[in-house]
Amino acid sequence: SERCDDWGLDTMRQIQVFEDEPARIKCPLFEHFLKFNYSTAHSAGLTLIWYWTRQDRDLEEPINFRLPENRISKEKDVLWFRPTLLNDTGNYTCMLRNTTYCSKVAFPLEVVQKDSCFNSPMKLPVHKLYIEYGIQRITCPNVDGYFPSSVKPTITWYMGCYKIQNFNNVIPEGMNLSFLIALISNNGNYTCVVTYPENGRTFHLTRTLTVKVVGSPKNAVPPVIHSPNDHVVYEKEPGEELLIPCTVYFSFLMDSRNEVWWTIDGKKPDDITIDVTINESISHSRTEDETRTQILSIKKVTSEDLKRSYVCHARSAKGEVAKAAKVKQKVPAPRYTVELACGFGATGSGSGSHHHHHH
């Protein structure tokens, strides 16, 4: 056969569908690979051909469009399953061609099973709701194109295994589920089951998404540096290890990039010659507020290093802040005999500061 532009296996489109439910799958050629749509291609005399390789086989075979009740059919650039079966899992190829032109792409289709509580290997979209923010809604996703607007489906919403009805905080409203005031207890998996008739048969579409209740923008603040602070002095002798934590709290902000960095004498640690290491750890609260800690470490500090300026910086969409660490060289305590000779009491170092020895 003549050459065909083969876009290979499009693993970015890992399509997952539920067993025993309708599925409509658009040929990815027109969505991601070609600069024209199906109508243009069809008008130009190009034909769309479908075939597949079933799971654990190498053999490409045509799709059987003559199954009872047209279980698998093609409509324009869409491959329809009414409904899917478990053994429909495999790699599907759509090929657009005429006598002079050919382009094709393959994509994996996985038919997955769900349990009585809608658990499955399906990757779930995550919808974030702001805590105590007023009415917010989630919408039953990916149901467009399955039935005409003249058909009025029934929609049932579940949290886990349990139907949502007459609940004071969460209200089903057709394709939408309204959260009057989102609380942490609303975290979880929510499922809409859309039931519609077609040619004397009843079909179900199951769509599950994860709701995560996050910090509200009403409560968001610029980054807060908890450490370094004015109460702690890092007092070291040359040769000791210097460890300074920079601990920063970030309010949750949708799509915000949280950054923490150190400067030493105004320069990034990478841009100076001293042997410094930075270790970062990140933790999250239940509402996805973030605490980042960057520990600056100099294994064997010199008296020169103890004169430098160590500043922790933090930035989010809410603003930028900075705080200098108080670093000083420990003054050796005067020898006891000298103190007596000079008439002083033995009072220790007398610095009054916190001596932090981080291990």
């Epitope: 009585s116 658990n119 949290m159 886990g160 295994c161 349990y162 139907k163 998996n189």
Partner: antibody, heavy 119, light 107 residues
Framework: QVQLVQSGAEVKKPGSSVKVSCKAS????????ISWVRQAPGQGLEWMGG????????NYAQKFQGRVTITADESTSTAYMELSSLRSEDTAVYYC????????????WGQGTLVTVSS | EIVLTQSPATLSLSPGERATLSCRAS??????LAWYQQKPGQAPRLLIY???NRATGIPARFSGSGSGTDFTLTISSLEPEDFAVYYC?????????FGQGTKVEIK
């Protein structure tokens, strides 16, 4: 740690009703669901139904539909199972068990409540 | 409803021996299956969920395998405290159902 404490043993007459309680502690009650499972003497386990602690909606096994009512009181972290029109074959140990809202396995169980139906 | 059939009904073994318990479903339950242990006068205890995941605090000698209709619970080396009745349970379809149990007794 998580504990489910059930009410005490009951002796009931045929045709009457019984209501068994299950008080949860050591976890966030509203984050879980409670199922009820029964076990007749010397027999296996039988799932009766379950309830979402937060939504108060229940799922029932067809066999018990119309005869069993499962409820939950979030304020006291307590679930209840009421079985009506009792017959001698309802004599069993009734267990409550906790699971996630979307969990299908029962990770913590109550100690069981023996209900004896006898004339 | 889905019927779970456990075999054998009774398994007579000595401490240190390997126990293999079977659970067969009347139709596919994928991997939506759990195993429980019950000792006389006690409530059941979750051992395995998702066909092969050990529950919190369950010793490594307990393992589960299988998918679809055939499942196995294996106790690699029986300890005295393992002699009990074991039940499988499916959550693929309503109502959730249990097998009739396998009794593991001391030989």
């Amino acid at each position: 740690q998580v504990q489910l404490v059930q009410s005490g043993a009951e002796v009931k007459k045929p045709g009457s009703s019984v209501k068994v309680s299950c008080k949860a502690s050591g976890g966030t009650f509203s984050s879980y669901a409670i199922s009820w499972v029964r076990q007749a003497p010397g027999q296996g386990l039988e799932w009766m139904g379950g309830i979402s602690a937060i939504f108060g909606t229940a799922n029932y096994a067809q066999k018990f539909q119309g005869r069993v009512t499962i409820t939950a009181d979030e304020s006291t972290s307590t679930a209840y199972m009421e079985l009506s029109s009792l017959r001698s074959e309802d004599t069993a140990v009734y267990y409550c068990a906790r699971h996630l809202h979307n969990g299908i396995h029962l990770d913590y169980w109550g100690q069981g409540t023996l209900v004896t139906v006898s004339s | 409803e889905i019927v779970l059939t456990q075999s054998p009904a009774t398994l007579s073994l000595s401490p240190g021996e390997r126990a293999t318990l079977s659970c067969r479903a009347s139709q596919s339950v994928s991997n939506f299956l759990a195993w429980y242990q019950q000792k006389p006068g006690q409530a059941p205890r979750l051992l395995i969920y998702g066909a092969s995941n050990r529950a919190t605090g369950i010793p490594a000698r307990f393992s589960g395998s299988g998918s679809g209709t055939d499942f196995t619970l294996t106790i690699s080396s029986l300890e005295p405290e393992d002699f009990a009745v074991y039940y499988c349970q499916q959550g693929k379809h309503w109502p959730w159902t249990f097998g009739q149990g396998t009794k593991v007794e001391i030989k």
